[in-house]
Amino acid sequence: DSEEDEEHTIITDTELPPLKLMHSFCAFKADDGPCKAIMKRFFFNIFTRQCEEFIYGGCEGNQNRFESLEECKKMCTRDNANRIIKTTLQQEKPDFCFLEEDPGICRGYITRYFYNNQTKQCERFKYGGCLGNMNNFETLEECKNICEDGPNGFQVDNYGTQLNAVNNSLTPQSTKVPSLFEFHGPSWCLTPADRGLCRANENRFYYNSVIGKCRPFKYSGCGGNENNFTSKQECLRACKKGFIQRISKGGLIKTKRKRKKQRVKIAYEEIFVKNM
């Protein structure tokens, strides 16, 4: 497979703050399914953090598909200030706060934090560097903000969003939410390059999901994660199809309509169903 001309990828100037999803299916790629109908539907795009139009084929697909823009926003965006900003009402913890700490199957052990539903506290564990689940935070503070109750028994402002007094819009605060790259399912194409813990300098490639390209990096020889390929072609084969987002003339972002097998996508969806 050729790289399919990298100029299609759109890169925004400003880096988006980390993303906290309301539902795991909001992270699924738009899936038009195998049928041939042309039906206008909406999906949540994790890269632009917006609900966008796509063409649905009429069968199969996944849960990230909505009849209307409003329904998509309701399910996948936090545009209702009353739901986000701390109130006197008890707020629910995300489901993943109740998952058992999961080191995953790799052995590049690093310190992470998980919410212990028995002690009601965030605690340290050793994460192996790949797979696992979403009850996995880089810092104690991040874990506390998402999963622990506040001092008065209410959920803390775990979506890290504040109301902008100027234009009444919601501004995400990047310090309070687990990053997009904290999804630990087989969505390895979304994980950052990880050189691992050893001292070698092997030439490898990883898929950069922000720019939609395979990029070289130096691998240490052990640890790291599964976003690690011995050739650019292998990287592109595994990750590029379906992850690239294109902007059409009409301004809406459309996903590629390829009928080839999409292993990554299927595994990605399965892991969320299993873990959530």
Partner: antibody, heavy 118, light 112 residues
């Protein structure tokens, strides 16, 4: 008061198997990750295995990986260590230990002796 | 694996006198979360290990304040300001920063 009591240690031949138990009391067992640590005859300490709070996931060093299996029964407040393909270098006092919220061993049992010899 | 080196192997101290044990690690024990997971255990004769100090300097409950832990990076020290008879035994440092967890070979404190 936290109390950890190991049992099951014995004299076993090389290549043999043995299952150790650790009865826990004085704390909410299911809230804590648990570990096994051994102390060799020359008094050196070696971490052997760790299991997560719910028992679904485990950690091992290379020296025992594939031979030892840590498990737990939260309903019975008991930690286990199934040892197989035992070698003479597995001879040691085996301690179970509780992991605190920092993932550090804070309380240790009194130990049970495993001797691997022909 | 991280190698933990303790000195001295044996320490003979008169009751009421201070004592100091050194522990060096083969790599920094400062973790990605900014904490240093260096701990000290005491194993009294015929007993199981008991944790004295964790996170370099935090004393476990019931541990007398004559014990102090200090250090950073790769060099750590356990000090006893005035040794008492109950302090005899083998002191172990161990690290919980890197997997696998590793232990020092121990320092035997004996009373002169």
């Amino acid at each position: 008061e936290v109390h950890l009591v190991e049992s099951g240690g014995d004299l076993v031949k090389p290549g043999g198997s043995l299952k150790l138990s650790c009865a826990a009391s004085g704390f909410t067992f299911s809230s804590y990750a648990m570990s096994w640590v051994r102390q060799t005859p020359d008094k050196r300490l070696e971490w052997v295995a760790t299991i997560t709070t719910g028992g679904s996931y485990t950690y091992y060093p290379d020296s025992v990986k594939g031979r030892f299996t840590i498990s737990r029964d939260n309903a019975k407040n008991t930690l286990y260590l199934q040892m197989s393909s035992l070698k003479s270098e597995d001879t040691a006092m085996y301690y179970c230990a509780r992991q605190d919220g920092n993932f550090l061993m804070d309380y240790w049992g009194q130990g049970t002796t495993v001797t691997v010899s022909s | 694996d991280v190698v933990m080196t303790q000195t001295p192997l044996t320490l003979s101290v008169t009751i009421g006198q201070p004592a100091s044990i050194s522990c060096k690690s083969s790599q920094s024990l400062l973790d990605s979360d900014g904490k240093t997971y260096l701990n000290w255990l005491l194993q009294r004769p015929g007993q199981s290990p008991k944790r004295l100090i964790y996170l370099v300097s935090k004393l476990d409950s019931g541990v007398p304040d004559r014990f102090t832990g200090s250090g950073s990076g790769t060099d750590f020290t356990l000090k006893i300001s005035r040794v008492e008879a109950e302090d005899l035994g083998v002191y172990y440092c161990w690290q919980g920063t890197h997997f696998p967890f590793t232990f020092g070979s121990g320092t035997k404190l004996e009373i002169k």
